[in-house]
Amino acid sequence: SGTTNTVAAYNLTWKSTNFKTILEWEPKPINQVYTVQISTKSGDWKSKCFYTADTECDLTDEIVKDVKQTYLARVFSYPAGHVESTGSTEEPPYENSPEFTPYLETNLGQPTIQSFEQVGTKVNVTVQDEWTLVRRNDTFLSLRDVFGKDLIYTLYYWKSSSSGKKTAKTNTNEFLIDVDKGENYCFSVQAVIPSRRTANRKSTDSPVECMGHEKGESRE
C-alpha cells in the first residue's frame, strides 16, 4: 500500500489577520508530503498546496471569495515522491480542521496612526484604513469597507509628562480631542469589533506616536 508509512496531520490551526488566512498543522514531514483541501459547508472540495513539504498553506485566495461563509479544510498525507495515479483507490490519511468563519474570526491587524494635527486646543488624530485582500469587482476593499460600523477605534492619549491615560472612541477613522495648550501628547489606537464576544475582539495597540515628531502638525 502506498500510504502505510504516512502519518495523519494534527493540530490543524487557522491563523488569520485582516483576512490573510493560513492553515498550519503538524508534524514536520519525514518522508511524506501534504495536500490541503478547503470547502464551504455546502460546496465542493478544492485542492490547494499540492504535495507540499511545508506545514502551512495560504488559503486567503479561497476565503476572500466570501468572508461571511464558514469554511472547513482537511490535510491529506502522502508518501514523499508521491505521484497521483488513476488506479489508486486507497484514501490517504487526513485530518479535518476546525470550522473557520473569517468575518467572525479573523484577527484585527495592528492599526497605524496616519497623522495628527493640532489646532489650538484640539487635536485631530487619523487612523490609516488598512487594505485587505477582499475584493469587490476588481477593487481591493479596506477593513472599513468590509466591517463598516461593526468596526470602531479606541484612542489612548496622555501627556508626555505624565502616565495618566484618557480614552476616546470613534466609528470613523478620525478622533477630535481636547488637549491642554502648550502640552505635548502621545497617542496609541486599537481597532475593536464590539459585536464580537471572543479574544479576537480587539487588535494589538498601534505604535505610539507623540507630538513634536514628524507625523504631527501644529497650527495656532
Epitope: K68, Q69, L104, R144, F147, K149, D150, T172, R196
Partner: antibody
C-alpha cells in the same frame, strides 16, 4: 436563494406578551445582521434594532430600548422580536431584514412582514 | 441621533419624465477611512416590503434598473430616476446607515400623473 420568512399575523390584548420570528435561509445566518423595522399604519419606516446571530450582539434604537427584546437562535437560523407587555401603540407591521454583504451596505433582503394588532 | 429630511414628500410624475428626490442628513455620512458615504435608498411599492435600491450613496444594488442613480456626499444626497415607469410608484426612503441608531427619512410618495 436568500429568504427571510416571518411568522404570521397576531391579534393581542394590551398587557399581553408576544414573540414574533424571522427565519433566514440560503445564506450563512451567523455572519449577517438581522434588522427589525416598524411601520405603523399609514406611516414611514422606523429602525428598532438589530442582532448579529453569531455573537448575540444587539443594538437598539433609544425609542425602542427597554420595550422590546431582540434575540436569535443560530441553531435554527431564526431571529426574534418580543414584547413583555404590549400597548395599543404597538399596532404595526414589523419587518425583519438582512444586512448586505459589505459594511454599511443597507438592508439587502426583507421578510414579508408580520402584522401585529393590539386592541382591547 | 442623525435626522434625515426628504423633499418633496409627494412627487407626481408623468411616465417617461425624470424625477428627483432630495435627502439631507443632520450630520455628515462620509466615512473618513474609506471616503464612502453611508446613505441608502429604498423603495416600498404599494402592499409590499421595502426593497434596497442604492447603497454607499451611489452604488446600485444588483438587479436594480440603471434608470435609478444616486449622488451626493456629506449631508446632501439625491436619488434620480431618469425616465419614470408605472412600476416605480411607491414610497422612497433614504436611510442613515452610518452610525447607530440607524434612521430613515420620512418618505417621498411617487405617483403617476
Amino acid at each position: 436563494e436568500v429568504q427571510l420568512v416571518q411568522s404570521g399575523a397576531e391579534v393581542k390584548k394590551p398587557g399581553e406578551s408576544l414573540r414574533i420570528s424571522c427565519k433566514g435561509s440560503g445564506y450563512t445566518f451567523i455572519t449577517y445582521w438581522i434588522e427589525w423595522v416598524r411601520q405603523m399604519p399609514g406611516k414611514g419606516l422606523e429602525w428598532m434594532g438589530d442582532i448579529l446571530p453569531g455573537s448575540g450582539s444587539t443594538n437598539y434604537s433609544p425609542s425602542f430600548q427597554g420595550h422590546v427584546t431582540i434575540s436569535a437562535d443560530k441553531s435554527i437560523s431564526t431571529a426574534y422580536l418580543q414584547w413583555s407587555s404590549l400597548k395599543a401603540s404597538d399596532t404595526a407591521m414589523y419587518y425583519c431584514a438582512r444586512s448586505g454583504y459589505y459594511g454599511n451596505s443597507g438592508f439587502a433582503y426583507w421578510g414579508q412582514g408580520t402584522l401585529v394588532t393590539v386592541s382591547s | 441621533d442623525i435626522v434625515m429630511t426628504q423633499t418633496p414628500l409627494s412627487l407626481p410624475v408623468t411616465p417617461g419624465e425624470p424625477a428627483s428626490i432630495s435627502c439631507k442628513s443632520s450630520q455628515s455620512l462620509l466615512s473618513s477611512g474609506n471616503q464612502k458615504n453611508y446613505l441608502t435608498w429604498y423603495l416600498q411599492k404599494p402592499g409590499q416590503s421595502p426593497q434596497l435600491l442604492i447603497y454607499w450613496a451611489s452604488t446600485r444594488e444588483s438587479g436594480v434598473p440603471d434608470r435609478f442613480s444616486g449622488s451626493g456626499s456629506g449631508t446632501d444626497f439625491t436619488l434620480k430616476i431618469s425616465r419614470v415607469e408605472a412600476e416605480d410608484v411607491g414610497v422612497y426612503y433614504c436611510q442613515n446607515d452610518y452610525t447607530y441608531p440607524l434612521t430613515f427619512g420620512q418618505g417621498t410618495k411617487l405617483e403617476i400623473k
